[in-house]
């Protein structure tokens, strides 16, 4: 079937990075500068995307693939193919309909995007809170109270770095 198709349509032999040039007896011609074809058998090459203004080039255009853009620092891509740029927030915040807002008490976000997530509930695993949570960090769960009873052998973990104003419960 493939061979039959190629006999009928010489363009099917043109690989990615070329186009079937009707002006030259359907010879496979390389894509001109600033254009590409990502599949074979194409009759035209597509114009490369230009990452301008708020968009920066993440990946250069090649003869077989389009350029890829990302956003200027402090912002991240949104939409198909990075059609928009949305602001990053600080750690301890989330992006809402009213802009970047601090995480509510009992929640945290350790990244510059995404939503605030609830602190881990240590007691669900039968553990205790070793280090309190903050807006930027989850709580650190320690051994269960039973593990800390006299005579119980336990390996003492290294003291975690604590943020000012937060002491373990």
């Amino acid at each position: 079937f493939e061979r039959t198709r190629s006999l009928q349509d010489p363009c099917s032999n043109c690989p990615a990075g070329t186009f079937c040039d009707n002006n030259r007896n359907q010879i496979c011609s390389p894509c001109p500068p600033n254009s590409f074809s990502s599949a074979g058998g194409q009759r035209t090459c597509d114009i490369c995307r230009q990452c301008k203004g708020v968009f920066r080039t993440r990946k250069e255009c090649s003869s077989t693939s389009n350029a890829e853009c990302d956003c200027t620092p402090g912002f991240h891509c949104l939409g198909a193919g990075c059609s928009m740029c949305e602001q990053d927030c600080k750690q301890g915040q989330e992006l809402t309909k009213k802009g970047c807002k601090d995480c509510c008490f009992g929640t945290f976000n350790d990244q510059k995007r995404g939503i605030c997530r609830p602190w881990t509930n240590c007691s669900l695993d039968g553990k205790s809170v070793l280090v309190n949570g903050t807006k930027e960090r989850d709580v650190v769960c320690g051994p269960s109270p039973a593990d800390l009873s006299p005579g119980a052998s336990s390996v003492t973990p290294p003291a975690p770095a604590r943020e000012p104003g937060h002491s373990p419960q």
Epitope: T72, G74, F75, C85, E86, G99
Partner: nanobody, 119 residues
Framework: QVQLQESGGGLVQAGGSLRLSCAAS????????MGWFRQASGKERELVAA???????YYEDSVKGRFTISRDNAKNTMYLQMNSLKPEDTAVYYC?????????????WGQGTQVTVSS
């Protein structure tokens, strides 16, 4: 309802300086992206500079090194310091604010202030 009011525009000689202000009322905009746009006669409105809530800034290529955007969240105000002005900077300058986007249509717009740079 959020209102944005620009001030500081005017007529200035090429090479001179102006400082535009954009005062917001009706809501604290500390978490918003704020931007300065301009529209020259017969041309499309373009984004000149923007600043995120965290202080990240963006400048259009033609104003880099000459314009500086800043914000004072305590005063709910944004500024655009324009130095080494050129005749091609002549336009109506608008301030805008959006909770999320650097690109696209901003939620809130000011009425604009005219900047004219004479040669």
């Amino acid at each position: 309802q959020v209102q944005l009011q620009e001030s500081g525009g005017g007529l200035v000689q090429a090479g001179g300086s102006l400082r535009l202000s954009c005062a917001a009322s009706g809501r604290t905009l500390s978490g918003y992206v704020m931007g300065w746009f301009r529209q020259a006669s017969g041309k499309e409105r373009e984004l000149v500079a923007a600043i995120s809530s965290g202080g990240s800034t963006y400048y259009e290529d033609s104003v880099k090194g000459r314009f500086t955007i800043s914000r004072d969240n305590a005063k709910n105000t944004m500024y655009l310091q324009m130095n080494s002005l050129k005749p091609e900077d002549t336009a109506v300058y608008y301030c805008a604010a959006d909770p999320r986007r650097l690109t696209g249509l901003y939620d809130y717009w000011g009425q604009g202030t005219q900047v004219t740079v004479s040669s």
